[in-house]
Amino acid sequence: LEVSESPGSIQVARGQPAVLPCTFTTSAALINLNVIWMVTPLSNANQPEQVILYQGGQMFDGAPRFHGRVGFTGTMPATNVSIFINNTQLSDTGTYQCLVNNLPDIGGRNIGVTGLTVLVPPSAPHCQIQGSQDIGSDVILLCSSEEGIPRPTYLWEKLDNTLKLPPTATQDQVQGTVTIRNISALSSGLYQCVASNAIGTSTCLLDLQVISPQPRNIG
């Protein structure tokens, strides 16, 4: 019995279906086919779980969280024992193993391993200003999304005719911050943060209004 090499890892957007491949070759009939799919969740590597089983010509549910979402892609028994997972969740991320036994065919590699990563687009980021908006001050524009896998990068832009930040601005795309030094009237305007990762983007807007000093009345 020989389980074929798997593609290594699969990425899928949250909520979308995933197909985890597992095929094998055997010299025996499929009368005594046993298949166990297991997962080692990334969130809890010490706690492997059963996903689905095929034993004695019957299918059995694995862990409750997979109930109604998991099944074999084809009619069993078969040499293609790939499974689908519908409505993928973040907690489905992990390392999946298919363990195949088909007596009397023993020996060879009877385990296939596939990694599953469930991706999440950035949630709507939160934009805020840190520091005084008085002329001549330094301000920091902050941007962060609560969700996003892979971790989003953040790009700040000024929504004016130049399509870019002023040269006095320093941007950190990982932290989502922009420091604008010595703000002037030219710094005023709408700024947009674009949070993006491999599967999506999300934006927020911030209106920076630089405050000019009020003329003092000398009485």
């Epitope: 990068t153 790009l155 832009e157 929504l159 005719n161 130049t162 399509l163 870019k164 930040l165 002023p166 040269p167 941007q171 795309q173 030219l186 947009q192 674009v194 993006s196 983007t201 934006t203």
Partner: antibody, heavy 121, light 108 residues
């Protein structure tokens, strides 16, 4: 080395399509707004299209609006120009250009070598 | 026709000073910054001046820029043979960038 390298030019019939690419290297591509600028044989420079660092904002010259699409893939450090419904008057050398981060205004501080697009039957 | 207007050609002898004008409107030069480019034959343009009067590193101080109202001017002093090239002004307006038609500088 900081550079821009255009590709994808060639001969195309009127009404046809072409996709130009501009591969950037040596700088943080996503931090810069980028533009396409063209130059017809023996003529002056004409700005074609611009795109912000994130790709979220795009501008077009009236002469290409509705026919050309600018885009970028920051993961590949590449700028694109999809040109549809090409006309004879689109024949030109097409340059990609980087907008300076040192300037408050628009200033193209880095240019590619250009790629020739010829629209002819 | 270009949105920004430049003289088609100017000429001067080596060592002399020359100016190139660029005329626009309130929707471009009047309310925004101007850049200038030099294009030698068969090469890509090169940035000479940005933000009206600033020079990128490596550009000699023989080159200068100024702006007044809706017009801008490029000045070149101490003309050299290698300055013979096409010169372009550039500005921007609402969701668009604009170039001048270009000026051919001949060093006599």
């Amino acid at each position: 080395e900081v550079q821009l390298l255009e590709s994808g030019g060639g001969l195309v019939q009127p009404g046809g399509s072409l996709r130009l690419s501009c591969a950037a290297s040596g700088f943080t591509f996503s931090s810069y707004a980028m533009s396409w600028v063209r130059q017809a044989p023996g003529k002056g420079l004409e700005w074609v299209s611009a795109i912000s660092g994130s790709g979220g904002s795009t501008y077009y010259a009236d002469s290409v609006k509705g026919r050309f699409t600018i885009s970028r893939d920051n993961s590949k450090n590449t700028l694109y120009l999809q040109m549809n419904s090409l006309r004879a008057e689109d024949t030109a050398v097409y340059y990609c250009a980087r907008d300076s981060r040192d300037a408050y205004g628009v200033a193209f501080d880095l240019w590619g070598q250009g790629t020739m697009v010829t629209v002819s039957s | 026709a270009s949105v920004l207007t430049q003289p088609p050609s100017v000429s001067a002898a080596p060592g002399q000073k020359v100016t190139i004008s660029c005329s626009g409107s309130s929707s471009n030069i009047g309310n925004n910054y101007v850049s200038w480019y030099q294009q030698l034959p068969g090469t890509a343009p090169k940035l000479l001046i940005y933000d009206n009067n600033k020079r990128p590193s490596g550009i000699p101080d023989r080159f200068s820029g100024s702006k007044s109202g809706t017009s801008a001017t490029l000045g070149i002093t101490g003309l050299q043979a290698e300055d013979e090239a096409d010169y372009y002004c550039q500005s921007y307006g609402h969701r668009s960038f604009v170039f001048g038609g270009g000026t051919k500088l001949t060093v006599l």
